[in-house]
């Protein structure tokens, strides 16, 4: 089957958050379909998303096998209705993706404040540890399991009655901060990997949680 009317994919882009990783590309297919291959620098090519009319392919299952490897993907274009033919020697047009190293490049997902508890003039704020699709012995690992001390959280907190923000940092998932008695505070957290030097160093801020709402507890 010929490939004369097929167009090579372009704008291959990795979209990855907390290691959930999707390769996207253009163009939207007209009379053609795509197959994706992925490999490590030293490994063999593995085909995924066979003859798809989509312009994205979820490669999470492959990259979570070793998030510290560097991966390369390529997208092949075939005529619509293409069936693999053993006699065909003509290589279909394809385009390579940029290299992708999940550990360095996956974006940090928006964190969530799990709880906060006030005891006198101290508030303990706990950040939920997000699960990833990275596995160890058939159990899924959390973001903390994967990044360890590479991952810190920044807490932004302010009195409900004012706009002046204070910050605190932790390399655990907990903050213990001093507050003024009788004041209500609001909180937002951000995940940060300080060792990164790129735009994906920080997550977006968590939703704001304020004292006096259901996530909080107050004890004198």
């Amino acid at each position: 089957s010929g490939t004369t009317n097929t167009v090579a994919a372009y704008n291959l882009t990795w979209k990855s958050t907390n290691f959930k990783t999707i390769l996207e590309w253009e163009p939207k297919p007209i009379n053609q379909v795509y197959t994706v291959q992925i490999s490590t620098k030293s490994g063999d090519w593995k085909s995924k998303c066979f003859y798809t009319a989509d312009t994205e392919c979820d490669l999470t299952d492959e990259i979570v096998k070793d998030v510290k490897q560097t991966y390369l993907a390529r997208v092949f274009s075939y005529p619509a209705g293409h069936v693999e033919s053993t006699g065909s020697t003509e290589e279909p047009p394809y385009e390579n993706s940029p290299e992708f190293t999940p550990y360095l490049e996956t974006n940090l997902g928006q964190p969530t404040i799990q709880s906060f508890e006030q005891v006198g003039t101290k508030v303990n704020v706990t950040v939920q540890d997000e699960w990833t699709l990275v596995r160890r012995n058939d159990t899924f690992l959390s973001l903390r399991d994967v990044f360890g001390k590479d991952l810190i959280y920044t807490l932004y907190y302010w009195k409900s009655s004012s706009s002046g923000k204070k910050t605190a940092k932790t390399n655990t998932n907990e903050f213990l901060i001093d507050v003024d008695k009788g004041e209500n505070y609001c909180f937002s957290v951000q995940a940060v990997i300080p060792s990164r030097r790129t735009a994906n160093r920080k997550s977006t801020d968590s939703p704001v949680e304020c004292m006096g709402h259901e996530k909080g507890e107050s004890r004198e």
Partner: antibody, heavy 120, light 113 residues
């Protein structure tokens, strides 16, 4: 097979400069921290600092900050520990090590060590 | 800085007998996020670099014999060798792998009787 190969033994005089190296192979060099550990003669292990070659980010033990510099050249998968002015008290075995795959999972692989002797 | 204190500093054990080393940290090594203790154990055999035995307080590194086991949480940790063998001689170190600066215990020297 993961390997860390360190440069050979050095004999130096106080005040001289020195750079020792640690070449990694058999793994993706940019995504694992390289740790540097000092062991003075007959003594225990002291963590000096580390570097993530992919970004060049470093952490130092305050006891060594300003006296040593940790760097890496990812194009040749090599990390370095250097001194601009050696002291007799720098006489020690220096090990490089590679962090484990998981977060905070120890130093999984070690170099053979570089013996540095500083004497007038 | 987190201070790591090992006891005893030396022990002499008959082959086939058990051995136990204690390690106490000046601050908790328990990560609230994933409930893991970031305490690591190493063995340094004579004339060799250290080798990783146990991480996350109780997870044996690949290839480490199952006679080695780690336990404990928070600030108190123990390394046990169920039946000491001649090849186990050397200095055992615990390490805070929780927060910078990473710190080691003073070491425990194991000898064979």
């Amino acid at each position: 097979e993961v390997q860390l190969v360190q440069s050979g033994a050095e004999v130096k005089k106080p005040g001289e400069s020195l750079r020792i190296s640690c070449k990694g192979s058999g793994y993706t060099f940019i995504t694992y921290w390289i740790e540097w550990v000092r062991q003075m003669p007959g003594k225990g292990l002291e963590w000096m600092g580390d570097i993530l070659p992919g970004s060049g980010s470093t952490n130092y033990n305050e006891n060594f900050k300003g006296h040593v510099t940790i760097s890496a050249d990812k194009s040749i998968s090599t990390a370095y520990l250097q001194w601009s002015s050696l002291k007799a008290s720098d006489t020690a075995m220096y090990y490089c090590a590679r962090s484990g795959y998981y977060g905070n999972s120890g130093f999984a692989y070690w170099g053979q060590g570089t013996l540095v002797t500083v004497s007038s | 800085d987190i201070v790591m204190t090992q006891t005893p500093l030396s022990l002499s054990v008959t082959p086939g007998q058990p051995a136990s080393i204690s390690c106490k940290s000046s601050q908790s090594l328990l990560s609230s996020g994933n409930q893991k203790n970031y305490l690591t154990w190493y063995l340094q055999k004579p004339g060799q670099p250290p080798q990783l035995l146990i991480y996350w307080a109780s997870t044996r590194e690949s290839g480490v014999p199952d006679r080695f086991s780690g336990s404990g949480s928070g600030t108190d940790f123990t390394l046990k060798i169920s039946r000491v063998e001649a090849e186990d001689v050397g200095v055992y170190y615990c390490q805070n792998d929780y927060t910078y600066p990473l710190t080691f215990g003073q070491g425990t020297k194991l000898e064979i009787k």
